[in-house]
């Protein structure tokens, strides 16, 4: 019996009847074994068929066989009822192997030419299966020539038998005071050969509860418990089942915090498995009570182990344990069914008692040392030589801990010093200089540092001078000897200030004229402003109004006299403003240069002479009456003036403090 | 304006006790707004609470310090006390009292002694 | 008990900001307070309970605390403010300092 050829070469080939194309003989048998590689198979067609037709096909026939299976007898030309011939089908071995036969009987009633077929190996495509039948591979099936091979989803791994996929399931760890587990793929069918383990693992202190929930489809057996698939649920106490069928179990409370649940398949079934969930208990903790202005977030029927609570107090309230303010509260439930942490007060905020305000009081207005949330006081000023600044002085304790003003600010409101208040009533007649009598120039500042001088109070550490009386001290400026608050120059009833620093105005240059002749001295501390100290104010923009041509204004000091010594009293002058060009004019013959008088002085005094400002007298504020506010403000300090004071067709030259306000508004600020 | 002072020996003896005050002027001991306590600094080092005691009698202590101190209040005086047993030249420094707020702006200590230097040595 | 850790020094120069942190497990779930010591001084208060500001004190004195760190900020640094600067809190009733850090102006 001629074989086909051997693999590996390659199969494929021509059969055809003895003496093809010419008839066929009768009683012949011829016998053709065809073999593949492993994993191909033989597909087979006829491109010729004329074989004598019988009933079915006893006489003439070509049998095609695979294994032990006949695919087909064939004889004829066309297929009958009965009988069947190739026509255009293509016959396929079911293995690797093929077997056609071709017989003959002893006759033929008329002459047949057999006939020629092909065949070819081909790659066996095992991934495919008839309907019906079970798939080649649980999951992915992947063919190739010769052969194929499984694979299986995420989560899954292919078994020894290198077609099921068994579930990767085991090592999963529950955490969580609750949750859901489930046989894998739930609720659809779980996967066979595997072998899951499921732990659930609390804190100690807690209790796991199971629920068998939904469904409940685990293959089982009528008669034997369980043989092929199962579930068990272990703690460390007791075991729980197996379970299995289609009855759900009942719950699980297995008063401990681990559990071990095991889930075992077989290799066969369609089974959905089961869904449990399961819940925890521990010992309740007390149930949390809020203190007074506070509660308890979020509240909860009970508070059991791990459980927690937070304490918030009220507006105006706030969280102490102790002694000791706490930003925040939470406390934890624990195991044994007590809490972490003692239930803490909400205290009313308290702002303490205010701060003293430098010269002023202040009052209590909700009740005598109210000092707590909401509670309100009020500062003043004290009166007649302080006013308060910007603030109305009314704070209130809010829920910071701050006493705060209507405005939201929580620094002290300031008692600015009254300034400009005189006791001395100005006249319109000028007359000599005169005694000044307490009171009258409470501005009136005494500078001692090598010669004498003066200067007027500015708020209640500064004093106004002239560059030229402090120039020598610009250094030094702890060597100044300032008094206040006397008439008498060698009184030694004074109030005593000290400098701390000296700013004389860039503009100046020392003996050479007497242009932006203005310094300012800052007091190392305020002075106490009362009837005999009080500051003089600065102009306003309007100033000017006061201060034109033949406006009176006054010169204090305890300059030369007309007897040539220091005056032992606090003197004063009243002296109109000269035109600027007359003074201009007096200043520029000898022996005082062209230029003398500038646009930052301004001159006052009597065409006649005899009242004037003189030696001694330097630094000191030439000051003006404002009408509209009946405040005292300086328009001049006393500067430069003729050799001899009070000489007629001279006059009192006075640094024009309006020209300077900006320079002294920066300084005060910045230092 | 409260003002505290504190005032002992400033030579003490290993193994023995050291005994500090501290009086309050300006201001009430008995005032409930207030705790009153003592802070250490050894020298070139930095600061160690030691305790704080409330009008009330009331004691905290540094946990590490606890088993030899003793704070104690005498509102008649209006001062309290240190007292620290079994000392040893780890126990020079100088030694504050300061006040402590109770109410809100509580817990911190706003007001300071001068502080006073302690040595032991033998 | 909380331990504190500030850096031993920090060095600014004039004009400029000075930041001195303070860190302890979980230090922003309670107060922190700020110390500023002058050599042969007594300490003073410059900060309580995290951000507030006592009376007197400049504004540019500044504080924070979250999470694990506190910190003193100082705007524009002056002469003056060069000095040992210290956290402190309250841990169970305990008063615990940080070790100090020296500012530097430079």
């Known amino acids: 019996t001629p074989l086909g050829p051997k693999w590996p070469e390659p199969v494929f080939g021509r059969l055809a009847s003895p003496g093809f194309p010419g008839e066929y003989a009768n009683d012949q048998e011829r016998r053709w074994t065809l073999t593949a590689p492993p994993g191909y198979r033989l597909r087979l067609y006829f491109t010729h068929f004329d074989l004598e037709l019988s009933h079915l096909c006893e006489y003439d026939f070509v049998k095609l066989s695979s294994g032990a299976k006949v695919l087909a007898t064939l004889c004829g030309q066309e297929s009958t009822d009965t009988e069947r011939a190739p026509g255009k089908d293509t016959f396929y071995s079911l293995g690797s192997s093929l077997d056609i036969t071709f017989r003959s009987d002893y006759s033929n009633e008329k002459p047949f030419t057999g006939f020629e077929a092909f065949y070819a190996a081909e790659d066996i495509d095992e991934c495919q299966v008839a309907p019906g039948e079970a798939p080649t591979c649980d999951h992915h099936c992947h063919n190739h020539l010769g052969g194929f091979y499984c694979s299986c989803r995420a989560g899954y791994v292919l078994h020894r038998n290198k077609r099921t996929c068994s579930a990767l399931c085991s090592g999963q760890v529950f955490t969580q005071r609750s949750g859901e587990l489930s046989s894998p793929e739930y609720p659809r069918p779980y996967p066979k050969l595997s072998s899951c383990t499921y732990s659930i693992s609390l804190e100690e202190g807690f209790s796991v509860i199971l629920d068998f929930v939904e469904s409940f489809d685990v293959e089982t057996h009528p008669e034997t418990l369980c043989p092929y698939d199962f579930l068990k649920i272990q703690t460390d106490r007791e075991e729980h089942g197996p379970f299995c069928g289609k009855t759900l179990p009942h719950r699980i409370e297995t008063k401990s915090n681990t559990v071990t649940i095991t889930f075992v398949t077989d290799e066969s079934g369609d089974h959905t498995g089961w869904k449990i969930h399961y819940t925890s208990t521990a010992q309740p903790c007390p149930y949390p009570m809020a203190p007074p202005n506070g509660h308890v977030s979020p509240v909860q029927a009970k508070y059991i182990l791990k459980d927690s609570f937070s304490i918030f107090c009220e507006t105006g309230y706030e969280l102490l344990q102790g002694h000791l303010p706490l930003k925040s509260f939470t406390a934890v439930c624990q195991k044994d069914g007590s809490w972490d942490r003692p239930m803490p007060a909400c205290s009313i905020v308290d702002c303490g008692p205010p701060d003293d305000l430098p010269s002023g009081r202040v009052e209590y207005i909700t009740g005598p040392g109210v000092t707590t949330y909401k509670a309100v006081i009020q500062y003043s000023c004290e009166e007649t030589f302080y006013t308060m600044k910007v603030n109305d002085g009314k704070y209130v304790c809010e829920a910071d801990g701050f006493w705060t003003s209507s405005k939201g600010e929580k620094s002290l409101p300031v008692c600015e010093p009254v300034c400009g208040l005189s006791a001395r009533t100005t006249g319109g007649r000028i007359y000599g200089g005169q005694k000044a009598k307490p009171g009258d120039f409470p501005w009136q500042v005494l500078i001692l540092g090598g010669t004498t001088a003066a200067g007027a109070l500015l708020y209640d550490n500064w004093v106004l001078t002239a560059a030229h009386a402090v120039y020598e001290q610009k250094h030094d400026a702890s060597a100044l000897d300032i008094r206040m608050g006397t008439l008498k120059r060698l009184s030694p009833h004074y109030t005593q200030a000290w400098s701390e620093a000296v700013f004389i105005h860039e503009g100046y240059t020392h003996d050479a004229g007497f242009d932006n002749d203005i310094a300012l001295i800052k007091l190392n501390n305020k002075v106490v402003i009362n009837s005999n100290i009080t500051p003089i104010c600065l102009p306003r923009k309007e100033a000017e109004s006061f201060m034109r041509t033949d406006d009176i204004g006054t010169a204090s000091g305890w300059g030369l006299t007309q007897r040539g010594f220091l005056a032992r009293n606090l003197m004063y002058v009243d002296i109109p403003i000269v035109d600027h060009q007359k003074c201009t004019a007096a200043y520029e013959k000898p022996p005082y240069p062209r230029g003398s008088v500038t646009a930052n002085m301004l001159c006052a005094g009597l065409e006649s002479g005899g009242k004037d400002s003189c030696r001694g007298d330097s630094g000191g504020a030439l000051v003006f009456l404002d009408s509209e506010t009946e405040r005292w403000f300086v328009g001049g300090i006393v500067s430069w003036g003729s050799m001899n004071c009070g000489e007629a067709g001279q006059y009192g030259v006075y640094t024009k403090v309006i020209n300077y306000i900006p320079w002294i508004e920066n300084i005060i600020s910045d230092f | 304006q409260v003002q505290l002072q504190e005032s002992g020996p400033g030579l003490v003896k290993p193994s023995e006790t050291l005994s500090l005050t501290c009086t309050v002027s300006g201001g009430s001991i008995s005032s409930g707004e207030y705790f009153w306590g003592w802070i250490r600094q050894p020298p070139g080092k930095g600061l160690e609470w030691i305790g704080s005691i409330y009008y009330s009698g009331s004691t905290y202590y540094n946990p590490s310090l606890k088993s030899r101190v003793t704070i104690s209040v005498d509102t008649s005086k209006n001062q309290f006390s240190l007292k620290l047993s079994s000392v040893t030249a780890a126990d020079t420094a100088v030694y504050y009292c300061?006040?402590?707020?109770?109410?809100?702006?509580?817990?911190?200590?706003?007001?300071w002694g001068q502080g006073t230097t302690v040595t032991v040595s033998s | 008990q909380s331990v504190l850790t500030q850096p031993p020094s920090v060095s600014v120069s004039p004009g400029q900001t000075a930041s001195i942190t303070c860190s302890g497990h979980?230090?922003?779930?309670?107060?922190a307070y700020w110390y500023q010591q002058k050599p042969g001084q007594s300490p003073v208060l410059v900060i309580y309970q995290d951000t507030k500001r006592p009376s007197g004190i400049p504004e540019r004195f500044s504080g924070f605390n979250s999470g694990n760190t506190a910190t003193l900020t100082i705007s524009g640094t002056q002469a003056t403010d060069e000095a040992d600067y210290y956290c402190?809190?309250?841990?169970?009733?305990?008063?615990?300092f940080g070790a100090g850090t020296k500012v530097t102006v430079l």
């Open positions: 402190q809190t309250w841990d169970s009733s305990t008063g615990v």
């Open positions: 979980k230090l922003g779930d309670k107060y």
């Open positions: 300061a006040r402590s707020l109770k109410a809100a702006r509580r817990d911190a200590f706003d007001i």
